[in-house]
Interface confidence: low
């Protein structure tokens, strides 16, 4: 799975969308989980309504909400009052029995503000960085890792936007 990057501003809300094949995942509940380490488990944050037909109803766990458009095939997660510690790697999952299929891997980046105060020379554009070769950026521009910085998750150094 490619990793999709979503960037949000601290204190504001961030919406994450996970498209899927509505026929293939017909009748399945969905979940949003946080990846604990590169090879660690994905810890459940919130899941859709116990009754699949009511999946359109928004369910909250703390500041995180989930809602599922089962006909259109789009799972939407809302992170309200985004905080720096919300940054990290997450997954949208489709549940069947005790199993879970990954719909999308998501990297959440929390920006103190939409632009960094570093030089514009730190910017990179998709396709110009090997460090992000398995990630594409939604509505944002990020920068590659600094030398020596750990590559997991492939997070940018905070803030470039548009």
């Amino acid at each position: 799975h490619n990793t999709t990057v979503f960037q949000g501003v601290a204190g504001q809300s961030l919406q994450v969308s996970c498209p899927y094949d509505s026929m293939k995942h017909w009748g399945r509940r969905k979940a949003w989980c946080r990846q604990l380490g590169e090879k660690g488990p994905c810890q459940r944050v919130v899941s859709t309504h116990n009754l699949w037909l009511l999946s359109f109803l928004r369910r909250w766990n703390g500041s995180t909400a989930i809602t599922d458009d089962t006909l259109g095939g789009t799972l939407t997660i809302t992170l309200r009052n985004l905080q720096p510690h919300d940054a990290g790697l997450y997954q949208c999952q489709s549940l069947h029995g005790s199993e879970a299929d990954t719909l999308r891997k998501v990297l959440v980046e929390v920006l103190a503000d939409p632009l960094d105060h570093r030089d514009a020379g730190d910017l990179w554009f998709p396709g110009e960085s090997e460090s992000f070769e398995d990630a594409h950026v939604e509505h944002s521009i990020s920068r590659s890792l600094l030398e020596g910085e750990i590559p997991f998750p492939p997070t940018s150094h905070h803030h470039h936007h548009h």
């Epitope: 204190g11 990846q35 510690h85």
Partner: antibody, heavy 116, light 113 residues
Framework: EVQLQESGPELVKPGASVKMSCKAS????????MHWVKQSHGKSLEWIGY????????GYNQKFKGKATLTVNKSSSTAYMELRSLTSEDSAVYYC?????????WGQGTLVTVSA | DIVMTQSTSSLTVTAGEKVTMSCKSS????????????LTWYQQKPGQPPKLLIY???SRESGVPDRFTGRGSGTDFTLTISSVQAEDLAVYYC?????????FGSGTKLEIK
């Protein structure tokens, strides 16, 4: 060059209000949060809150809710902080600071003295 | 709120000496998602606003001399000045940059003999 120019010192009476300003230059004002920090004489720093000039969104330290109100004027690239119902406890230097990875840019500070 | 504790309020050293000051947070500042510690160090000289020295616990701000080094993870952090210069006379503050409300330590005043 990024600069934050704060308004001059204020001498105010207890119970009154004061509104200070922070004029930003050298960058796109609407692209960065502006934070406000209090420093009482000889004391540490206290984070008051921030405003996102692009949409006026704010976040406050619970301690300063009802005391401080943050606003901006986008056309003049100026952030404002109003303090109300002033007491001697509010006597301090107030800084505006532009955020990023930490607060890399600070205003010179506005000294507020509350005295009868 | 996260409480930041700088247990040493003042340190007196001779120019050229190495000095280390500590900062403890009441909860971890480590983001498990990106393995960064949201801890910032500032230097404040008399009559001036604070100056950013270190962000993410160990990343030196542009233009800051390399004699300043930040270390630590989780709840325990240090700022080391490898060879103190006369111009380093200042108060040093650590700050929780992890969650709102941002909070600062009480500061460590560095004095030169």
């Amino acid at each position: 060059e990024v600069q934050l120019q704060e308004s001059g010192p204020e001498l105010v009476k207890p119970g009154a209000s004061v509104k200070m300003s922070c004029k930003a230059s050298g960058y796109t004002f609407t692209d960065y949060n502006m934070h406000w920090v209090k420093q009482s004489h000889g004391k540490s720093l206290e984070w008051i809150g921030y405003i996102y000039p692009n949409n006026g969104g704010t976040g406050y330290n619970q301690k300063f809710k009802g005391k401080a109100t943050l606003t901006v004027n986008k056309s003049s690239s100026t952030a404002y902080m109003e303090l109300r119902s002033l007491t001697s406890e509010d006597s301090a230097v107030y800084y505006c600071a532009r955020s990023g990875r930490g607060f890399a840019y600070w205003g010179q500070g506005t000294l507020v003295t509350v005295s009868a | 709120d996260i409480v930041m504790t700088q247990s040493t309020s003042s340190l007196t050293v001779t120019a050229g000496e190495k000095v280390t000051m500590s900062c403890k947070s009441s909860q971890s500042l480590l983001n498990s998602g990106n393995q960064k510690n949201y801890l910032t160090w500032y230097q404040q000289k008399p009559g001036q606003p604070p100056k950013l020295l270190i962000y993410w616990a160990s990343s030196r701000e542009s233009g800051v001399p390399d004699r300043f080094t930040g270390r630590g993870s989780g709840t325990d952090f240090t700022l080391t000045i490898s060879s103190v210069q006369a111009e380093d006379l200042a108060v040093y503050y650590c700050q929780n940059d992890y969650s709102y409300p941002f909070t600062f330590g009480s500061g460590t005043k560095l004095e030169i003999k």
